[in-house]
């Protein structure tokens, strides 16, 4: 029959060439001559000439060695031609397999690769992957097919074998406890690729193996006790440094300090922050310390990382002894502000109050005063006994420097400290009200028609203060009640003016006196403009004349 | 010489607690991942609970996890297995051993827990 | 159910050799050459009487042996004694959690 079994030729064949393969017949030639040729690629198209076939005897030839690794199979077709060049048969499919042989080593794909696992890790913890190829075949023999080992590891501490890698994958395990970035932050392994399953070509390259930092080391203060003077009152002042050592990698949160206070900040005096730098604790003075009360604060603080221990481990503490160092502290006026009532108009010289400061400081110390600031300058203040009295005339009604019926008034104590300090007090006189104002119109001028005149209301005001005031009495004096009527209203607090004879248009000047609740009088001259109009006037219309 | 010796076991009710221990010496306690292996009577060994050389990490076998809790003190050279919620599966014999790279040794003498009402 | 599948037990006489045999997958006994073999004799600790497939500890017998090939690890006695007498135990190193299995155990018996 024309056909032919697949046929299989090794790679790398040492010939000699041309080699005979497989021969092709056709049973036509019993009857006639028969030529054989061949076609296809590897015959006669790229890569041509790689076989060829004996035109006469139909043994298919090899010319040369095969590669597996370029061409894996070829497909050619036979031909059977009788002399005339007819054809005899159909085209035969030939098949031919080149089987493989280990001629390639197995490749890494890097020359060093890298990977990385948490220190203090367990045994079975994946750590990176390393991949070799083969161009040998891995499906029907075990040229191509790669086992991986680990040749060696530098350094080969705290055991020879702290790795191991599947055979298979070239997944590298950690197999051995004791990872310690602190102690070994970097393994490097030598690894092996071997062909034949193992049995075979080997190959290595290089796995950097990187531990990465857990926070496995508490950090540690060095030293443990410290001595820091710290002046009195002084805010926001630091007051020590603390210094700590982490084994843990610089800058990152298992070494980056957090400082608290355990103990022996009962005031809430003391606060401590973490340098970005330094990792220092800064302790400072959230408030100022008071020598006279406590001269001396023992602190413990104790330090953790931003990271939580991966572990159990001791925190260290810190004994802080702070000395408050004693400072000439001003003088305190005791209140600080201080309320007096006093009635105005008091005769100069009369006391107004004592007010004196006090010393925190523990010595007996001089205080002297002096006003400060005195607006109107009505008072004088005693040097030693902080005596203050009245050198002018107190007035509740001056609206320049009395706001709300107060006076306020700064005084200034000043310790013979070395250097002397001072402190200073307000002092708000509350001025009682005395009837010394009588009661005023307003307005003082008035314009009014001598024909059915319409009536002027004016409104009363007193400067002083209720029972002083309200309800007011009005008279009319020399002799302006021939003309005029004045009237205080019910309320008490407006008076009636109206014109009660025919006066020609002129200006006159009606006397008016109102005195209030507390028969405090007060004359006034209205300047009443009359004019030659009915009812309601503004202005008098037309010319007139003053008089 | 290599050794570990286990203590703390005896008999406990259902639902008790126990704390198991394991003194280490002759060998660098802190280099070396602990295990403890259990073995109920007639039966083959079973992992119970493992913790690396630092303290770091631990595992747990799942018929025992949420209940129990292995530590250690590297500065004692002691394994602890803290044992709450027992139940009368968890009756064997307990083996402390050390992971030495590839395999388990030393192993200790055992430590007999019944639970038991 | 245990990871590793020993026979439950075998047996031979005085002199005689015996082996077990110990089946995993490619991801532990055929991955890794860190099988190992102990001894327990009954009331006893387990012993390790091999390690690395092969490796003897110092004070082991010579006629203690081990093997692999494929996901099969075998342990080899040659020269059986009455002191054989005990339950075997295999185990091999996995990567991830847990990181060993356990086999069974095989009861020799020393007939």
């Known amino acids: 029959d024309w056909v032919v079994a697949p046929i299989s030729v090794p790679e790398n064949g040492k010939g000699p060439f041309p080699q005979r393969l497989n021969q092709l017949k056709s049973n036509k030639d019993r009857d006639t001559k028969i030529f054989y040729s061949i076609t296809g690629p590897g015959a006669d198209s790229p890569p041509e000439g790689v076989f060829a076939v004996e035109k006469e005897t139909g043994w298919l030839l090899l010319n040369k060695p095969l590669d597996r690794e370029e061409i894996a199979k070829y497909e050619l077709f036979g031909h059977a031609v009788s002399e005339n060049g007819a054809s005899v048969e159909d085209p035969m499919n030939i098949s031919i397999i080149v089987t493989d042989q280990n001629d390639h080593k197995p490749k890494f794909t890097q020359d060093t690769f890298r990977g990385s696992v948490l220190e203090g890790v367990l045994p079975g913890t994946s750590v990176m992957q390393v991949t070799a190829t083969d161009e040998d075949d891995a499906i029907y023999t075990y040229n191509g097919v790669v086992a991986y080992s680990i040749h060696s590891q530098e350094p080969k501490d705290p055991h020879d074998l702290m790795f191991t890698i599947h055979r298979s994958t070239g997944t590298i395990s950690v197999i051995s406890s004791g990872l310690d970035r602190e102690k070994v932050p970097e393994y490097t392994l030598t690894i092996q690729a071997t062909d034949m399953d193992g049995d075979g070509s080997t190959t290595t390259a290089v796995a950097v193996v990187e531990i990465l930092d857990a926070n496995d080391n508490a950090p540690m203060f060095d030293p443990q006790k410290y001595e820091a003077h710290v002046p009195e009152n002084a805010v926001g002042h630091e007051v020590q440094r603390l210094t700590v050592t982490d084994l843990d990698a610089p800058n990152s949160p298992a070494w980056r300090a957090t400082y608290l206070i355990m103990g022996g900040d009962d005031g809430d005096h003391f606060t401590i922050t973490t340098h970005p730098e330094s990792n220092q604790g800064i302790l400072t003075t959230r408030k100022g310390l008071d020598f006279e009360a406590k001269n001396q604060h023992t602190l413990y603080v104790e330090v953790t990382n931003e990271a939580p221990f991966v572990l159990k481990l001791p925190t260290s503490t810190a004994t802080i002894v702070v000395h408050v160092e004693d400072v000439n502290e001003a003088p305190v006026f005791v209140p600080p502000s201080k309320v007096v009532e006093v009635q105005e108009g008091i005769p100069t010289g009369e006391p107004v109050c004592v007010y004196t400061a006090e010393d925190p400081d523990k010595e007996n110390q001089k205080i002297s005063y002096r006003i400060l600031r005195d607006p109107a300058g009505w008072l004088a203040m005693d040097p030693d006994s902080g005596q203050v009295t009245a050198v002018g005339t107190l007035d509740r009604e001056d609206e320049q420097f009395v706001r709300n019926n107060i006076y306020e008034v700064m005084v200034l104590a000043m310790d013979n400290g070395s250097p002397p300090t001072t402190g200073t007090g307000t002092l708000l006189l509350t001025l009682i009200d005395v009837n010394d104002h009588g009661p005023v119109p307003e307005p003082r001028q008035i314009t009014i028609c001598n024909q059915s005149p319409v009536r002027q209301v004016l409104n009363i005001t007193d400067k002083d203060l209720s029972p002083h005031t309200s309800p007011f009495q009005a008279q009319l004096t020399d002799d302006s009640d021939i003309y005029w009527t004045a009237e205080v209203n019910e309320e008490g607090d407006t008076v009636v003016l109206s014109l009660k004879k025919f006066l020609k248009q002129d200006t006159y000047d009606v006397h008016l006196s109102l005195s209030d609740h507390g028969n405090k009088e007060q004359l006034t001259v209205i300047r009443a403009t009359v004019c030659d109009c009915h009812g309601h006037v503004e202005t008098c219309p037309g010319p007139w004349k003053g008089g | 010489e290599v050794q570990l010796l286990e203590s703390g076991g005896g008999l406990v009710q259902p639902g008790g607690s126990l704390r198991l221990s394991c003194a280490a010496s002759?060998?660098?306690?802190?280099?070396?991942?602990m295990s403890w292996v259990r073995q109920a009577p007639g039966k083959g060994l079973e992992w119970v609970s493992a913790i690396s050389g630092s303290g770091g990490s631990t595992y747990y076998a799942d018929s025992v996890k949420g209940r129990f809790t292995i530590s250690r003190d590297n500065s004692k050279n002691t394994l602890y297995l803290q044992m709450n919620s027992l139940r009368a599966e968890d009756t064997a014999v307990y083996y402390c051993?050390?992971?030495?790279?590839?395999?388990?040794?030393?192993w200790g003498q055992g430590t007999m827990v019944t639970v038991s009402s | 159910q245990s990871a590793l599948t020993q026979p439950a037990s075998v047996s031979g006489s005085p002199g005689q050799s015996i082996t077990i045999s110990c089946t995993g997958t490619?991801?532990?006994?055929?991955?890794?050459?860190?099988v190992s073999w102990y001894q327990q004799h009954p009331g006893k600790a387990p012993k390790l009487i091999l390690s690395e497939v092969n490796k003897r500890p110092s004070g082991v017998s010579n006629r203690f042996s081990g093997s692999k090939s494929g996901n099969t690890a075998s342990l080899s006695i040659s020269g059986l004694q009455a002191e054989d007498e005990a339950d075997y135990y295999c185990?091999?190193?996995?990567?991830?959690?847990?990181?060993?299995?356990f086999g069974g155990g095989t009861k020799l018996t020393v007939l």
């Open positions: 051993a050390s992971w030495g790279g590839g395999w388990f040794d030393p």
């Open positions: 185990s091999s190193f996995t990567s991830g959690l847990p990181w060993v299995l």
């Open positions: 002759g060998f660098t306690f802190s280099s070396y991942a």
């Open positions: 490619s991801n532990d006994v055929g991955a890794y050459n860190y």
